[in-house]
Interface confidence: low
C-alpha cells in the first residue's frame, strides 16, 4: 500500500494491476479504438471524465519529485470510474452480456485505489456522481465514451507505474 | 470573457418551489461546468450544487440533497436550479459562477475560489 508523505507505493503490484486494468478496458469494448462517434455535444460529454494532464506530476521528473501528487490524480481518476462502472450507466437496460469483463474491470479498479490509498490517511474524493440517463440508447452511448476514455486514461496510469516499478522501486 | 445572468427567483411560501436560471454568454459557454451557490445575510457564501460540462456530474450540498435539481441546456447555454419543499434556511442571494475548467475530481468543486465567472445573483426569500 502507499503511505503519506512522500513514501513509494507497491510500484510493482500497481504495475501488473495497471496492466490486467488495460487488458480488462480493451477486452470490455474493444471496437472502442476502431469507432470514433463524433455526434453533437461529444466534446462536452468526454470533458467530464479525467484525464492525466500536464502538471499533475505524472511525468518522470514529477515522479521523482513527489509521487503524491500524481497517485493523488490516478486515485482520483480510479474512484471515479469505480463509480461510474457500478452505476446506472452499466447496471441498467440494457443488461450487459453475463460474460462482460465489465464487472472485473469494476473489481480491478477498486482493487488499484485501494493499493494507493494511504495507510490511515483518506485522500478526499468526491460525493457519487449523479447519472440518470432516461432512455437505454443513451446509457449505451456513455457507456461507450466512458470505456474509451477509461482506456486511455489506464494506458497513461500503466505507463505510470511501470516506469515506478523500474526506476523508483526501493 | 463569460457573462453570466441569474434570474427565477423572488418571494415564495415556505414548502413551495422556484426554479432559478442561469444564462450564459459571451465565449463558447456550452461546457462550461457550472456550480451554484448561496449567500445569506451575515453568512459566508455556501455551496448549492454543481454540474460538469456535458451534464454527466451533478453533485448537491447535504442540505440540499432531495430537494434542489441542478440540469442544464447546452443549446440555450443556460443552467437551472429547480428548487422544491423551501423553507426559510433557503433564503440567501443565489449566484451561478463557472470555473474555466471542469472540476470533476476532488474536492474543488464546493470552493467559491475554484470558480473565475460569477453572476449578479437572485434573491430567493422563503417566508414561513
Known amino acids: 500500500r502507499a503511505v503519506p508523505g512522500g513514501s513509494s507505493p507497491a510500484w510493482t503490484q500497481c504495475q501488473q494491476l495497471s496492466q490486467k486494468l488495460c487488458t480488462l478496458a480493451w477486452s470490455a469494448h474493444p471496437l472502442v479504438g476502431h469507432m470514433d462517434l463524433r455526434e453533437e455535444g461529444d466534446e462536452e460529454t468526454t470533458n467530464d471524465v479525467p484525464h492525466i494532464q500536464c502538471g499533475d506530476g505524472c511525468d518522470p521528473q514529477g515522479l521523482r519529485d513527489n509521487s503524491q501528487f500524481c497517485l493523488q490524480r490516478i486515485h482520483q481518476g480510479l474512484i471515479f470510474y469505480e463509480k461510474l462502472l457500478g452505476s446506472d450507466i452499466f447496471t441498467g437496460e440494457p443488461s450487459l452480456l453475463p460474460d462482460s469483463p465489465v464487472g472485473q474491470l469494476h473489481a480491478s479498479l477498486l482493487g488499484l485505489s485501494q493499493l494507493l490509498q494511504p495507510e490511515g490517511h483518506h485522500w478526499e474524493t468526491q460525493q457519487i456522481p449523479s447519472l440518470s440517463p432516461s432512455q437505454p440508447w443513451q446509457r449505451l452511448l456513455l457507456r461507450f465514451k466512458i470505456l474509451r476514455s477509461l482506456q486511455a486514461f489506464v494506458a497513461v496510469a500503466a505507463r505510470v507505474f511501470a516506469h515506478g516499478a523500474a526506476t523508483l522501486s526501493p | 470573457e463569460v457573462q453570466l445572468v441569474e434570474s427565477g427567483g423572488g418571494l415564495v411560501q415556505a414548502g413551495g418551489s422556484l426554479r432559478l436560471s442561469c444564462a450564459a454568454s459571451?465565449?463558447?459557454?456550452?461546457?462550461?461546468?457550472m456550480g451554484w451557490f448561496r449567500q445569506a445575510p451575515g453568512k459566508e457564501r455556501e455551496f448549492v450544487a454543481y454540474?460538469?460540462?456535458?451534464?454527466?456530474?451533478?453533485y448537491y450540498a447535504h442540505s440540499v440533497k432531495g430537494r434542489f435539481t441542478i440540469s442544464r441546456d447546452n443549446a440555450k447555454n443556460t443552467v437551472y436550479l429547480q428548487m422544491n419543499s423551501l423553507n426559510s434556511a433557503d433564503t440567501a442571494v443565489y449566484s451561478c459562477?463557472?470555473?474555466?475548467?471542469?472540476?470533476?475530481?476532488?474536492?474543488?468543486?464546493?470552493?467559491?475560489?475554484?470558480?473565475?465567472?460569477w453572476g449578479q445573483g437572485t434573491q430567493v426569500t422563503v417566508s414561513s
Open positions: 459562477a463557472a470555473p474555466k475548467r471542469d472540476l470533476y475530481l476532488g474536492s474543488r468543486y464546493p470552493v467559491p475560489e475554484s470558480y473565475d465567472y
Open positions: 459571451g465565449r463558447t459557454s456550452s461546457s462550461y461546468s
Open positions: 454540474i460538469s460540462g456535458g451534464g454527466l456530474t451533478i
